[in-house]
Interface confidence: medium
Amino acid sequence: AGLKLMGAPVKLTVSQGQPVKLNCSVEGMEEPDIQWVKDGAVVQNLDQLYIPVSEQHWIGFLSLKSVERSDAGRYWCQVEDGGETEISQPVWLTVEGVPFFTVEPKDLAVPPNAPFQLSCEAVGPPEPVTIVWWRGTTKIGGPAPSPSVLNVTGVTQSTMFSCEAHNLKGLASSRTATVHLQLVPRGSSAHHHHHHHHSAWSHPQFEK
């Protein structure tokens, strides 16, 4: 069986939320059992069509209505022929969208006027991703390349911080971190606290 992907480039870049149909053409077999494979695992769902063009020419379609980051990867189709599995050339599917946060600023409790740090990291594609920092409704830092650490010399009241990630597809806003004031026991001096408070909160879920 001559097996090839039809009309699809080796690298396919699609914007998040857009539809994609991957095509696979199988010639030289009367009844191919076409399987789609993503990153080595057979795609086990019904988002597939198999169309006989002629007796020995079939086209398989893998249809994705609205791609998201988890759909990115290496796709190929395969058929069994005489006990051997033949595989097609792969298609690399890249899903582009607004930045996705891998680290967002975390809530902290710090003594008055004590220095602390907040972390923010976001990824594409597309890259590069730049970070802008906000204190309440005031822009206070950036744009700087991701990842970014905001060094704050101290606060005297509970304050809200957030970061914004930008790339060619647009921007995404992080969660808002609240930095609370730690109650300091009488007799201790707040400005003697020089240790840094790190924020490295991971946000694995991706919500469309």
């Epitope: 059992d33 069509l49 379609f61 209505k65 609205s66």
Partner: antibody, heavy 125, light 108 residues
Framework: EVQLVQSGADVKKPGASLTISCQAS????????ISWVRQKPGKGLEWMGQ????????LYGPSFQGHVTISADRSTATAYLQWRSLEASDTAMYYC??????????????????WGPGTLVTVSS | SYELTQPPSVSVSPGQTARITCSGD??????AYWYQQKSGQAPVLVIY???KRSSGIPERFSGSSSGTMATLTISGAQVEDEADYYC???????????FGGGTKLTVL
């Protein structure tokens, strides 16, 4: 012309076994999937499961898994829906449906379906 | 198990626009299909892949999908459009199909 010819209406008692059939013509049976769809009297449509004539690979809806068996005979281009032990709640019209697609210009699939006329199954003591 | 939710009934006057909705958590990722079933007849595919009209279906029938909601629109409904309409889609897992509960369209 694509045709799906279903077996005639049947009346059975609870606990009886039954097989109904759907014979396909006008196309290559092994090229397509055939689904079975249930419609109880005065109620909506329910997808039961499907079989691909080519490899007799089957898929079932969660409500029907284990209660019915879908099979096919390639030599006669016929799909079957089988019960080992009928219940009164199985009383319904059963449709077989051929799923299909054609290509326009060789790359864009256009979806279509052919439905059989239905087989009425009545289960009553 | 996965469900698609439709309103039980929709009524319009002849010439008005009828809209029938179908909601399901997987619809942002799975295509919706629409069937028309007239009394005593087998269903007919009207719309496939959210918005594509099946061959032989009048242009007044259209489909759309946004988020978790798919919509069948009949612009200028006619008396002969009176029927039950069902949406149909893949489950969130993609392993089985599901019909909505059906909507009875009355064209008064």
């Amino acid at each position: 012309e694509v045709q799906l010819v279903q077996s005639g209406a049947d009346v059975k008692k609870p606990g009886a076994s039954l097989t109904i059939s759907c014979q396909a013509s006008g196309y290559t049976f092994t090229d397509y999937w055939i689904s079975w769809v249930r419609q109880k009297p005065g109620k909506g449509l329910e997808w039961m499961g499907q079989i691909r004539g080519q490899h007799s690979s089957t898929l079932y809806g969660p409500s029907f898994q284990g209660h019915v068996t879908i099979s096919a005979d390639r030599s006669t281009a016929t799909a079957y829906l089988q019960w080992r032990s009928l219940e009164a709640s199985d009383t319904a019209m059963y449709y077989c449906v051929r799923h299909g697609a054609s290509t326009s210009g060789g790359t864009i699939p256009e979806y279509y379906q052919h439905w059989g006329p239905g087989t009425l199954v009545t289960v009553s003591s | 198990s996965y469900e698609l939710t439709q309103p039980p009934s929709v009524s319009v006057s002849p010439g008005q626009t009828a809209r029938i909705t179908c909601s399901g958590d997987a619809l942002p990722k799975k295509y919706a299909y629409w069937y028309q079933q007239k009394s005593g007849q087998a269903p007919v595919l009207v719309i496939y892949e959210d918005a594509k009209r099946s061959s032989g279906i009048p242009e007044r029938f259209s489909g759309s999908s946004s988020g978790t909601m798919a919509t069948l629109t009949i612009s200028g409904a006619q008396v002969e459009d009176e029927a039950d309409y069902y949406c149909y889609s893949l489950s969130d897992s993609g392993n089985y199909f599901v019909f909505g509960g059906g909507t009875k369209l009355t064209v008064l």
